[in-house]
């Protein structure tokens, strides 16, 4: 799957939306790699 910075950001936004924002504080685009998905 796409691992560019923009793809990672959009995937994380989707994950946050689906989880209702209940994730670790450091779960932000610049801290996560593609393996997080």
């Amino acid at each position: 799957s796409c691992n560019t910075a923009t793809c990672v950001t959009h995937r994380l936004a989707g994950l946050l939306s689906r989880s209702g924002g209940v994730v670790k504080d450091n779960f932000v685009p610049t801290n996560v790699g593609s393996e997080a998905f």
Partner: antibody, heavy 119, light 107 residues
């Protein structure tokens, strides 16, 4: 309110370098990647590179063959784009841009910095 | 690099018209495409990401579709403030690349 505020217009001679700044506010600067994009007069947008402000890791458009350097000052929440060995074709408006999730999910752009390269 | 070919390069339309702009990628980019609106002397404004998702605050008359290599931006009923240049962008691969733009002018 999220804002990306860029430095002012620059006029440079061919062969010189220019360093454009982009000060971020209204969000956690180190959480989101920062992109740099330019647009020459009447031309399409052109992506130059991005930086992870947290780690300092960068990706560059190889078209610029090492002429571009993107850096950040985390303490000042500011990103920089330096372009060296300027030529007339580098005359363009340079933009910083970042996709933010919190507080508002949006793709924010700076106002642009005009760089003119002329002898 | 992936080429993004936009068509038409310009079009004339009237307020209330339905406008369709297409973008073709030179290779598969999945749905990793964004659309931007730009007015003269202004920074681009993001409209669409992931081919079909509108950012908050973007009017519902703007819609995007497509996957793979073929993408479309549709303005269902053109408004006076929509006269601008529109760009597509792929972010599936580095370097990100943009289409050549479509200028939407008043007929």
């Amino acid at each position: 309110e999220v804002q990306l505020v860029q430095s002012g217009a620059e006029v440079k001679k061919p062969g010189a370098s220019v360093k454009v700044s982009c000060k971020a506010s209204g969000y956690t600067f180190t959480d989101y990647y920062m992109n740099w994009v330019r647009q020459a007069p009447g031309q399409r947008l052109e992506w130059m590179g991005d930086i992870n402000p947290n780690s300092g890791g960068t990706n560059y458009n190889q078209k610029f063959k090492g002429r571009v350097t993107i850096t950040v000052d985390k303490s000042a929440s500011t990103a920089y784009m330096e372009l060296s060995s300027l030529r007339s074709e580098d005359t363009a408006v340079y933009y910083c841009a970042s996709i933010i999730i919190v507080p508002n999910y949006f793709d924010y752009w700076g106002q642009g910095t005009t760089v003119t390269v002329s002898s | 690099d992936i080429q993004m070919t936009q068509s038409p390069s310009s079009l004339s339309a009237s307020v209330g018209d339905r406008v369709t702009i297409t973008c073709k990628a030179s290779q598969n980019v999945d749905t990793n495409v964004a659309w931007f609106q730009q007015k003269p002397g202004k920074a681009p404004k993001s409209l669409i990401y992931s081919a079909s998702y509108r950012y908050s605050g973007v009017p519902s008359r703007f819609s995007g579709s497509g996957s793979g290599t073929d993408f479309t931006l549709t303005i269902s009923s053109l408004q006076p403030e929509d006269f601008a240049t529109y760009y597509c962008q792929q972010y599936n691969n580095y370097p990100y690349t943009f289409g050549g733009g479509t200028k939407v002018e008043i007929k």
